[in-house]
């Protein structure tokens, strides 16, 4: 059973007193909330390019704009990893690169960006409207994913401009790290303001995730977020994806994320803020995630010394550092 988490909606402030004081009281919390919520939000960019020499050969470049250290990058096609997407490559800074056909060459370009070349022949080769997604797991920000595809009328050799992803999925480590501290600080500020002014302040509506279904797929975008951002998941042409691949589809391992509300990474603009969110450039889209899920007491996909908080779609010991069990 899959639950659909709602995007945390910012409630409009309750009617207040007229005049300058009333306006100031209303504006200040909004400004504070805006600063708090958007502070330090990382971004992921994705660039998809078709090679002029081989018309069915693609180069995908992805980068992470954040201050944390990257602990894993997963590149998938056909949608986000775990939500119908098939893993093409897993890049671990310490343990190397594991890639699956039709991926030909995955590489680290810099400390925070990677590139992946796809084969241009065979039944499993991509086509122009295939969607590619990059997920960066970093500490302390958590896990962030963005997706992109070629614009519909791309000329060979041209590429879609790098698409920054304004809101992406924050995972447990990020929530418990910097984001948690920020959020706590902001809530505390609002609490102080509220006590000081004796006036109701704007509040975050809790996500309406069903507590009875903690195993909802963490990578499936919610209906609410799809509707609000017009994310074209439904229009992905899957005919270009392999029907029968003998390569790995490393989505193994249970969902074990804690059920926590995430913070909105957009500038709040009142109740309609989500609907008016800027959409990425044509040919690209953003995966919006707003619920983190866990199965209480369930064993993580792999445990042992050196295990970090991030699960790895490829299964065994992906996140283990160089000092593993001997």
């Amino acid at each position: 059973m899959r639950t659909e988490a709602q995007v945390p909606a910012l409630q409009p402030p309750e009617p207040g007193l007229e005049g300058a004081m009333g306006h100031r009281t209303l504006v200040l919390p909004w400004v504070l909330l805006t600063l708090c919520v958007t502070a330090g939000t990382p971004e992921v960019w994705v660039q998809v390019r078709m090679e002029a020499t081989e018309l069915s050969s693609f180069t995908i470049r992805c980068g992470f704009l954040g201050s944390g250290s990257i602990s894993l990058v997963t590149v998938s096609w056909g949608g986000p990893n775990g939500a119908g997407g098939t893993t093409l490559a897993v890049l671990h800074p310490e343990r190397g690169i594991r890639q699956w056909a039709p991926a030909r060459q995955a590489r680290w370009e810099t400390q925070s960006s990677i590139s992946l070349i796809l084969e241009g022949s065979g039944a499993s080769s991509p086509c122009a409207n295939t969607t590619f997604c990059c997920k960066f797991a970093s500490f302390p920000e958590g896990s962030w994913e963005a997706c992109g595809s070629l614009p519909p009328s791309s000329d060979p050799g041209l590429s879609a401009p790098p698409t920054p992803a304004p809101i992406l999925r924050a995972d447990l480590a990020g929530i418990l790290g910097v984001s948690g501290v920020l959020l706590f600080g902001c809530v505390y500020l609002l609490h102080l303001l509220r006590r000081h002014k004796h006036r109701p302040a704007p509040r975050l509506q809790p996500s309406r995730t069903s507590p009875q279904a903690p195993r909802a797929r963490a990578w499936a975008p919610s209906q609410a977020s799809q509707a609000a951002l017009h994310v074209p998941y439904a229009t992905i042409n899957t005919s270009c994806r392999p029907a029968t691949l003998d390569t790995a589809h490393p989505h193994g391992g249970p969902s074990w994320w804690a059920s926590l509300p995430t913070h909105a990474a957009h500038r709040p603009q009142g109740p309609a803020a989500w609907a008016s969110t800027p959409i990425p450039a044509r040919g690209s889209f953003v995966s919006v995630e707003n619920g983190l899920y866990a199965q209480a007491g369930e064993r993580p996909p792999h445990t042992g010394p050196g295990l970090t908080l991030f699960p790895d779609p490829r299964g065994p010991r992906a996140m283990e550092g160089p000092l593993g069990v001997r």
Partner: antibody
Framework: EVQLQQSGPELVKPGASVKISCKAS????????MNWVKQSHGKSLEWIGE????????NYSQKFRDKATLTVDKSSNIAFMELRSLTSEDSAVYFC?????????????WGQGTSVTVSS | DIVMTQSPSSLAMSVGQKVTMSCKSS????????????LAWYQQKPGQSPKLLVY???TRESGVPDRFIGGGSGTDFTLTISNVQPEDLADYFC?????????FGGGTKLEIK
């Protein structure tokens, strides 16, 4: 102590199939991919593919995609490799090798090898 | 796939001598993320399976004598045995462990005079 114990030598006829095994002990079998490597007589090493014992996911070298099938029996900590449509080119020693602790493909433990001879 | 080339194909040394063998890769094995070179060296004694000696170009596997020294960066790598012993008679293979598929060099056969 980590050990990979492979099945004994095989003499098979051209066109036939053979299934060789690799029993792992001394570590958590499902925590590391199992690799298979071919060594033709007096020659270098060729990577055939790998399998994730946790869920059976496989990853093959392009060259061996139609030749080898990798499987595991999680309950008994055994990895298998089946080779089909055998020809004299497939006569070689086949090794199973455990994924490294420090790196995916720095293989830190190897089986003793299984010799496969294809002859009519 | 990354192509690995080893040289020489064989060499004969006397006990106590220092030996250096070379390995070249068709593309850089340096990981831009952490500046590690993903190159491994294996020793295969006659009738035995390969044994991991060195990984990340210069990190010795536990239990490997310190006379085995890995070096190099990018595309050019070396394995040096500083004080050759009779038990070092073996084939030595380099292998890139940067990405799938891992590929091996043709090997260097070390013979003891």
């Amino acid at each position: 102590e980590v050990q990979l114990q492979q099945s004994g030598p095989e003499l098979v006829k051209p066109g036939a199939s053979v299934k060789i095994s690799c029993k792992a002990s001394g570590y958590m079998f499902t925590d590391y991919y199992m690799n298979w490597v071919k060594q033709s007589h007096g020659k270098s090493l060729e990577w055939i593919g790998e399998i994730n014992p946790n869920n059976g996911d496989t990853n093959y070298s392009q060259k061996f995609r139609d030749k080898a099938t990798l499987t595991v029996d999680k309950s008994s900590n055994i990895a298998f490799m089946e080779l089909r449509s055998l020809t004299s080119e497939d006569s070689a020693v086949y090794f199973c090798a455990k994924e490294g602790v420090s790196s995916y493909y720095a293989m830190d433990y190897w089986g003793q090898g299984t010799s496969v001879t294809v002859s009519s | 796939d990354i192509v690995m080339t080893q040289s020489p194909s064989s060499l004969a040394m006397s006990v106590g001598q220092k030996v250096t063998m070379s390995c070249k890769s068709s593309q850089s094995l340096l990981n831009s993320n952490n500046q590690k070179n993903f190159l491994a060296w294996y020793q295969q004694k006659p009738g035995q399976s390969p044994k991991l000696l060195v990984y990340f170009a210069s990190t010795r596997e536990s239990g490997v004598p310190d006379r085995f020294i890995g070096g190099g960066s990018g595309t050019d790598f070396t394995l040096t045995i500083s004080n050759v012993q009779p038990e070092d008679l073996a084939d030595y293979f380099c292998q890139q462990h940067y990405s799938t598929p891992p590929t091996f060099g043709g090997g260097t056969k070390l013979e003891i005079k």
